[in-house]
């Protein structure tokens, strides 16, 4: 038996045009192997007329293709202008004709409806342009040009070459004469819409030696495609309208009671508050195509949805549409994980993230999500050691715990880190994944030094103090840098005296450096961990400066540590004017234009459909 | 919401006929995909066929499971929301509980999708 697998039977009428699917096992070979349509010969040979190495009969030439999808397993061969002669036996195959890795396929070609002798048939999408071509002898080059719509019983004048449009097609038809050269007038209809469909006669001339051309135009409604996605995951909906409206606004709205289509998302700024922090419109290409990335899915996010463009950004009638209907899996393969994570001002956040366990050496990157215009999402972080300029010392992505979840560490908040961030990675671009960061009122939980500077060739030691609250942890002390926070010995010094309220389960952990060099400048953090998962944590910043005086420095929480020009806070803790320190991040504007990874490689810079699309899949 | 009701099933012998209907309400008929699949006891649910319509190109597609081509024969009525899957020369081995489906052609093979399925008509084939 074939594992090959399509439709035995495909019916159609002439003049129209088939997809026929065929699906294979995915495996390396069978994608990359070489993919037929053949026509069964009465004697049992099987005559190719295209395959994916580039051939096409000459029967099929102008009218067929075929395209693998390797990803999906299949192949789909499309044939246009179908006629009778068409009918026949098939086969769709992988490899050579004859080998048997193929499908029958039965296609039935029969006559269209009764249309006029003489009518050529126009299918058009709705919201699209038609040019229908109405030609003419000689005789009638001077005469009256014009074009009817049958309705009912009687035609009616929809535009003609004295200048009469019909009110029902104002500012969207136009009859063009051609050249003297060429017998042939055409009308042009813009913005089509479902009424403009039916019969037309177009005439040149107007007595009895008038020559005249029937049209059928049908006018289709997009059939929504069937799109499938977990509960938690992603969709993207990639919509081509065509050059055409490349410069018109666009937008993706979901279909509510009756014809009400309710905006999503615009190029013009509106967007759904339903969708905030969950919603990329990615920018136009040059031809007006343009995706829509919904992450986070909810239940109620299933529906239809339709993107168009029409200079209102919403939907009106002649607007050229593509459908969708999106159904949301609650069956999900993505794990549930918080949608919102909450951390106070000066403390710390951990964020868990899926992905597809299957995945595990792709590449995993975490973004903020923006607002502003269409959305966008600037990346922060990779798992490649690239970590934007101004998050240096205070983020870490872990590939901790794996096995389906990587975590994101981000430390020294403030209210300004308070928002919408993705978890994404260069595979399965279905699991985007969204978290809400809230800033809270509170105090962090762990307590260090506010900065640090250690002397050249001595030994340095920093205090890190954890309440009660984390006597089960497991307590670390790591020195950051962009691939992650490399673990250090650290002392238990006993239980800690900084906290009220709090008893002997309380603990001070200090980090020793001995005999400090250059190298030891930097961000350090402490933190609490269970295995593999990852809790709070606090970040210093070690300086390091020449030799003034013999002995070691023990960096305390008291006052007597505070530096000129730091503001000491009652508790013993300082808060470090801007001009006190040398803080790297106080330099992150410098920083972000000589990061040259951070400009030149567009795909790191801001997540679009283009950072992590690239790999194929769309809305399904 | 769509909404899936089957009728039509019940006892026949074998070599016999039956005709199954799926009746559809709720949603757009003519932009789904339709499909049979069947149940028998102790078994797994299994691929019995499936009918494909583009009202764009005015085309449709009809697929098999390879137990049934040539016996079984699977036709929609738009203008009656209906499916139905005309069974001949019936073996014991059919007897199952079918099921209308929508479906979804995705990845390599026929997948359904177990929001919308009718109750199922028990189909009994006697020796």
């Known amino acids: 038996k074939s594992p090959i697998f399509g439709p035995e039977e495909v019916n159609s009428v002439e003049g129209n045009s088939v997809s026929i699917t065929c699906y294979y096992p995915p495996t390396s070979v069978n994608r990359h192997t070489r993919k037929y349509w053949c026509r069964q010969g009465a004697r049992g040979g099987c005559i190719t007329l295209i395959s994916s190495e580039g051939y096409v009969s000459s029967k099929y030439a102008g009218r067929a293709n075929l395209t693998n999808f390797p990803e999906n397993g299949t192949f789909v061969v499309n044939i246009a202008q179908l006629s009778q002669d068409d009918s026949g036996r098939y086969k769709c195959g992988l490899g050579i004709n004859s080998r048997g890795l193929s499908f029958d396929v039965s296609l039935e070609v029969s006559q269209g409806p009764g249309l006029l002798n003489d009518t050529k048939v126009y299918t058009v999408d709705l919201g699209r342009t038609v040019t229908i071509n109405c030609p003419f002898k000689t005789e009638n080059a001077q005469k009256r040009k014009s074009l009817y719509k049958q309705i009912g019983l009687y035609p009616v004048l929809v535009i003609d070459s004295s200048g009469y449009v019909n009110p029902n097609y104002t500012g969207r038809i136009r009859l063009d004469i051609q050249g003297t050269g060429q017998l042939l007038f055409s009308v042009v209809i813009n913005q089509l819409r479902l009424s403009d469909a039916g019969q037309y006669l177009c005439q040149a001339g107007d007595d009895s030696n008038s020559n005249k051309k029937n049209a059928d135009l049908q006018v289709l409604k997009p059939e929504p495609e069937l799109v499938y996605e977990d509960l938690r995951g992603s969709v993207t909906f990639h919509c081509a309208l065509g050059p055409e409206v490349a410069n018109v606004a666009k937008f993706l709205c979901r279909q509510s009671s009756g014809e009400n289509c309710d905006v999503v998302v615009n190029t013009l700024g509106k967007r759904a508050p339903a969708f905030e922090g969950r919603i990329l419109l990615n920018p136009q290409d040059k031809d007006g195509s343009f995706s829509v990335v919904i992450t986070g899915l909810r239940k109620e996010d299933a529906g239809r949805y339709l993107c168009g463009a029409h200079s209102d950004g919403q939907l009106q009638e002649g607007s050229p549409i593509q459908a969708w209907q999106l159904f949301v899996n609650e069956e999900s393969t993505i794990p549930r994980s918080p949608t919102v994570v909450k951390g106070v001002a000066g403390g710390s956040v951990a964020v868990l993230c899926p992905y597809n366990r299957k995945e595990s050496k792709s590449i995993k990157y975490w973004c903020l999500w923006e607002g502003a215009q269409n959305g966008r999402c600037p990346l922060l972080v990779d798992s490649e050691g690239w970590v934007k300029a101004q998050y240096e010392g205070r983020l870490s992505l872990l590939e901790e715990p794996g096995n389906g979840t990587f975590t994101v560490i981000l430390n020294q908040l403030t209210s300004r880190d308070a928002g919408f961030y993705w978890c994404l990675t260069n595979g399965d671009t279905l699991w985007r994944t969204t978290v809400e960061i809230k800033i809270i009122e509170g105090e962090p939980n762990l307590k260090v030094p506010g900065n640090v500077t250690a002397v050249l060739g001595e030994t340095l030691k920093v205090p890190c103090h954890f309440p009660c609250k984390f006597s089960s942890y497991e307590k670390y002390w790591c020195k950051w840098n962009n691939t992650g926070c490399q673990a250090l010995p650290s002392q238990d010094e006993g239980p800690s005296k900084a906290f009220v309220n709090c008893d002997e389960n309380s603990r001070l952990v200090s980090l020793t450096l001995n005999l400090v060099t250059r190298a030891d400048e930097g961000w350090y953090w402490c933190g609490v961990k269970q295995g593999h998962f990852y809790g709070e944590t606090a970040a210093v910043y070690v300086a390091v400066e020449e030799r003034k005086a013999a002995g070691s420095r023990d960096v305390s929480l008291a006052k007597a540590d505070a530096a000129p020009d730091e503001k000491v806070l009652d508790s013993g803790f300082r808060e470090i004017e801007n001009k006190a320190i040398q803080d790297p991040r106080l330099f992150a504007e410098e920083k972000a234009v000589a990061d040259t990874r951070d400009q030149a490689d567009g795909s790191r810079a801001s997540v679009d459909s283009g950072s992590s699309e690239e790999q194929g899949g769309s809305s399904r | 919401q769509l909404q899936l009701v089957e009728s039509g099933g019940g006892l026949v012998q074998a070599g016999g006929s039956l005709r199954l209907s799926c009746a559809a309400s709720?949603?757009?008929?003519?932009?789904?995909?339709m499909g049979w699949f069947r149940q028998a006891p102790g078994k797994e649910r299994e691929f019995v066929a499936a009918?494909?319509?583009?009202?764009?190109?005015?085309?449709?597609?009809?697929y098999y499971a390879d137990s049934v081509k040539g016996r079984f024969t699977i036709s929609r009525d738009n203008a009656r929301n209906t499916v139905s899957l005309q069974m001949n020369s019936l073996k014991p081995e059919d007897t199952a509980v079918y099921y209308c489906?929508?479906?979804?052609?995705?990845?390599?093979?026929?997948?359904?999708?177990?929001?919308?399925w009718g109750q199922g008509t028990q189909v009994t084939v006697s020796s």
């Open positions: 009918i494909q319509w583009s009202s764009a190109s005015a085309s449709t597609y009809y």
């Open positions: 489906a929508n479906l979804v052609f995705r990845v390599g093979a026929l997948k359904e999708r177990d929001d919308y």
């Open positions: 709720g949603r757009t008929f003519s932009t789904s995909t």
